[in-house]
């Protein structure tokens, strides 16, 4: 049903859903701090633009009695319960920030007449793609998929002279929320990734993964997995690995690779790490000082959600336009705004664009080095290191199928 919005007469409210079930196990206090820091910035920007208005956030907490798994498994109904609570209290703001679980976002989008914008730090799954009033501020699965297909097809780089058409995907069901949906997208038989590959098999058991590493009859040399180096080590240990195996480790929200004193462990030598290009350091920010790298990205997405709202509010107010309209609800896409850490670009469907970075381990220095970058906005790969010091033969990535010549 339609809920009246606290969103007019110079007073603009943001509804922030503080859900017990969340994409990342982040204390709600940290998210509150991020939102409040964002509000301070927005107020300053509006004031500088000569707009004398009030912007506040209302934090809506669920009671946590029923939906208390803490992860996303029981988030589907929690989101709807919170919406009901908002509806009963007639406390809907101009914008809804909050659901980070794919399940809850999908259900909330489905079961409500959304005449207001929804901003999510998460909602990684393909089922949240192409939603007209949903904006996602952390890289969704679709963006990962497009990179992988682009990289698989690339065959004209000094270090990658074969296009690939095969892959194993390791997915054992214990993944974090982001990894779960990334791998889910790769596994889906109707996804772009599956459509573009000739062969793809999902490995679900540790032993399956371990056996492939030295199996002469393997159907692909490439294995995609998601998680950090420790996750890989737990699985792979110090086992021998065939020389033409390439492991692609998807670890987008981890900037530990970009710490100066980091040395890559020996087990990372046959691994290419896909991560996001780090922004400027957030370590001096009050909300992120005590956060791990992953959680910093999550809190930052909340903060940027507030800044995005401020950006849109400023534009609409300067143009004398009404905020409680479908036009406003549909406007949070195809734009660039000033985020906390620099410009943030949203694509035509409201999903954040970013620069992904593919790292390799230099056999000379045992340090991580950038092999290439990928701009999700233009779906283009840019080689950086034309003569990488790889572990693979001739310092080139091997063919994806052993024994197959150049194509």
């Amino acid at each position: 049903s339609q809920v009246s919005q606290n969103c007019h007469n110079g007073s603009y409210e943001i509804s922030v859903l503080m859900m017990g079930n969340s994409a990342f196990a982040e204390p709600l206090k940290n998210l509150e701090d991020a939102v409040n820091e964002g509000l301070e910035i927005v107020r300053g920007r509006l004031q500088n633009a000569g707009l004398n208005v009030t912007v506040n956030a209302t934090f809506m907490y669920s009671d946590g009695l029923i939906h208390n798994s803490g992860d996303c498994r029981s988030s589907t109904c929690e989101g709807l319960d919170l919406l009901r609570k908002i509806s009963n209290a007639q406390r809907m703001g101009c914008v809804l920030i909050g659901p980070s679980c794919t399940y809850s976002t999908f259900q909330m989008y489905l079961d409500t007449e959304l005449s207001y914008p929804m901003i999510s730090a998460g909602s990684f799954g393909l089922s949240c793609d192409y939603k007209e009033t949903l904006t996602r501020l952390m890289s969704p699965a679709r963006k990962l998929m497009y990179f992988l297909v682009n990289f698989w097809k690339t065959n004209d780089l000094p270090f990658k002279t074969y296009s690939w058409s095969t892959s194993y995907v390791y997915k054992n069901g214990t993944e974090t929320e982001d990894c779960f949906w990334y791998l889910n997208a790769l596994e889906a038989s109707v996804s772009y990734f599956s459509h573009e590959l000739g062969f793809k098999v999902v490995l679900r058991q540790d032993k399956e993964f371990q056996d492939i590493l030295m199996d002469h009859n393997r159907k692909s040399n490439v294995i995609i997995m998601c998680g950090g180096p420790e996750f890989l080590y737990k699985l792979k240990g110090d086992r021998a690995v065939a020389e033409d195996i390439v492991i692609i480790l998807v670890d987008l929200f981890n900037d530990q690779y970009f710490e100066d004193n980091v040395t890559a462990p020996d087990y990372m030598k046959n691994v290419l790490v896909l991560t996001l290009s780090p922004g400027n350091s957030l370590l001096n920010s009050s909300f992120s000082r005590n956060l791990s790298p992953t959680k910093r990205d999550f809190a930052l997405a909340y903060l940027n959600g507030i800044l995005l709202f401020g950006h849109m509010l400023k534009i609409f107010l300067e143009n004398g336009e009404n905020i409680t309209t479908p036009k406003f609800a549909h406007a949070f896409r195809n734009l660039t705004f000033e985020g906390y850490d620099g410009p943030v670009t949203l694509d035509d469907w409201g999903d954040v664009d970013s620069t992904m970075v593919l790292l390799y381990t230099s056999v000379d220095t045992k340090k991580y080095k950038v092999l290439l970058t990928y701009d999700t906005h233009v779906n283009k790969t840019y080689p950086v290191d034309m003569s990488p010091t790889f572990t693979w033969k001739n310092s080139k990535l091997p063919n994806d199928i052993t024994g197959r010549g150049p194509q």
Epitope: F258, E259, D260, S277, P278, V357, K367, Y368, K369, V370, L371, T373, Y382, V384, D385
Partner: nanobody, 123 residues
């Protein structure tokens, strides 16, 4: 002796492309952070792109999406690929190197500079 030599400049039409090279001698590029700078007539020198020693490119907003940087350690050479060139890109382009204190950040200042190569964008 440490030396940086730029090449590849010239006259190009708006919308066109150029690839500049910066050849290093007397040191290994791989251990250094490298920056491309430019100075337009009557203006101050400005940073265009930096490549940290770890290989992370950092771009000025004015060239993002148009310019890309790469490094070939086997040739000890750095490249600046410039696409969709505009009249305002007209300048002398310099490459500079700095013994890196951080693998992932651009240095505040550079120790070694090349002589520059002129890029003119005009129809």
């Amino acid at each position: 002796e440490v030396q940086l030599v730029e090449s590849g400049g010239g006259l190009v039409q708006p919308g066109g492309s150029l690839r500049l090279s910066c050849a290093a001698s007397g040191f290994t590029l791989d251990d250094y952070a490298i920056g491309w700078f430019r100075q337009a007539p009557g203006k101050e020198r400005e940073g265009v792109i930096c490549l940290t020693s770890g290989g992370l490119p950092k771009y000025a907003d004015s060239v993002k999406g148009r310019f890309t940087i790469s490094r070939d350690n086997s040739k000890n050479t750095l490249y600046l690929q410039m696409n969709s060139l505009r009249a305002e890109d007209t300048a002398v382009y310099y490459c500079a190197a700095s013994g890196a204190t951080s693998r992932w950040n651009c240095p505040p200042q550079y120790d070694h500079w090349g002589q520059g190569t002129m890029v003119t964008v005009s129809s």
